[in-house]
């Protein structure tokens, strides 16, 4: 890989309510079925058109499910997986983790042990900071004019 | 991309057998996190489900019109799946098509359903005289 690709990560909890045709997702993932580099996780890999997921708006391909009605999904086998959303009734909540890439380069998941996914107050912060420090310069310069 | 090719069609006589071959030619690693199916289309005719195999081949599916007759079967390492077609009959003659998902879904499979399926293949002319 060239370059070095930073992710914010974030957490949110997702409360889906089974429809006609289920929850709408695809999964891929486990400790048998490592998706990810380093990291058994259980990752979104399709949403289908139409379904409970795609209608909710929030779950997106490539999102980590950490949990499923308060069940830990570390260290499951990939088929455990499936049918705990399978098992799971008709109102399910996720706790899933979405990356968002915020520099140029390749796209791609990063593992658990890869330290380069950024937290989003590190990004936030400067930003932040900058903006205060040029809303305070502008405000000077026109008390010149 | 996923990028799925399928090769072994071909002229046949009732009885006779083939073997039907899918392979990616683009993914790499991501194959054997795929669900994929057989799909076939006579002229004149919906697109009919023939099987279907979950990501590691332990689990597999098959239409009444072909069960004992065909096998689904696939080898990760080779980023292949394929289709063991015996005792071919002429009503077997149609256009043979692989279809992938990503993922397992985390619903109850509806494998003969068209609409899980987000990658299809060129398909390859099975004709049984």
């Known amino acids: 890989m060239n370059g070095r690709v930073d992710y914010l990560v974030t957490e949110e909890e997702i409360n889906l309510t089974r429809g006609p045709s289920g929850l709408g997702f695809n999964i891929v993932g486990g400790t048998d079925q490592q998706y990810v580099s380093n990291d058994s996780g259980i990752y979104v890999s399709r949403i289908k058109e139409n379904g409970a997921a795609a209608l909710d708006g929030r779950l997106q391909e490539g999102d980590k499910i950490l949990s499923v009605n308060g069940q830990d999904l570390k260290n499951l086998l990939h088929q455990d997986a499936v049918d705990l959303f399978r098992n799971a009734g008709y109102a399910v909540s996720l706790r899933v983790q979405h990356r968002l890439q915020v520099q140029n380069g390749p796209i791609g998941h990063r593992g658990e042990g890869d330290p380069s996914g950024i937290p989003i107050f590190m990004v936030l912060v400067p930003v932040f900071a900058l903006t205060m420090v040029a809303a305070w310069a502008f405000m000077r310069y026109r008390q010149q004019l | 991309e996923v990028q799925l090719v399928e090769s072994g069609g071909g002229l046949v006589q009732a009885g006779g057998s083939l073997r039907l071959s899918c392979a990616d030619a683009a993914s790499g690693r991501t194959f054997s996190t795929y669900t994929m199916g057989w799909f076939r289309q006579a002229p004149g005719k919906e697109r009919e489900f023939v099987a279907h195999?979950?990501?590691?081949?332990?689990?597999?599916y098959y239409a009444d019109s072909v069960k004992g007759r065909f096998t689904i079967s696939r080898d990760n390492a080779k980023n292949t799946m394929y289709l063991q077609m015996n005792s071919l009959k002429p009503e077997d003659t149609a256009v043979y098509y692989c279809?992938?998902?990503?993922?397992?879904?985390?619903?109850?499979?509806?494998?003969?359903?068209?609409?899980?399926?987000?990658?299809w293949g060129q398909g390859t002319q099975v004709t049984v005289s």
């Open positions: 195999i979950n990501w590691d081949g332990s689990n597999t």
């Open positions: 279809a992938a998902a990503i993922g397992s879904t985390v619903d109850s499979y509806r494998h003969s359903d068209p609409l899980e399926y987000d990658y």
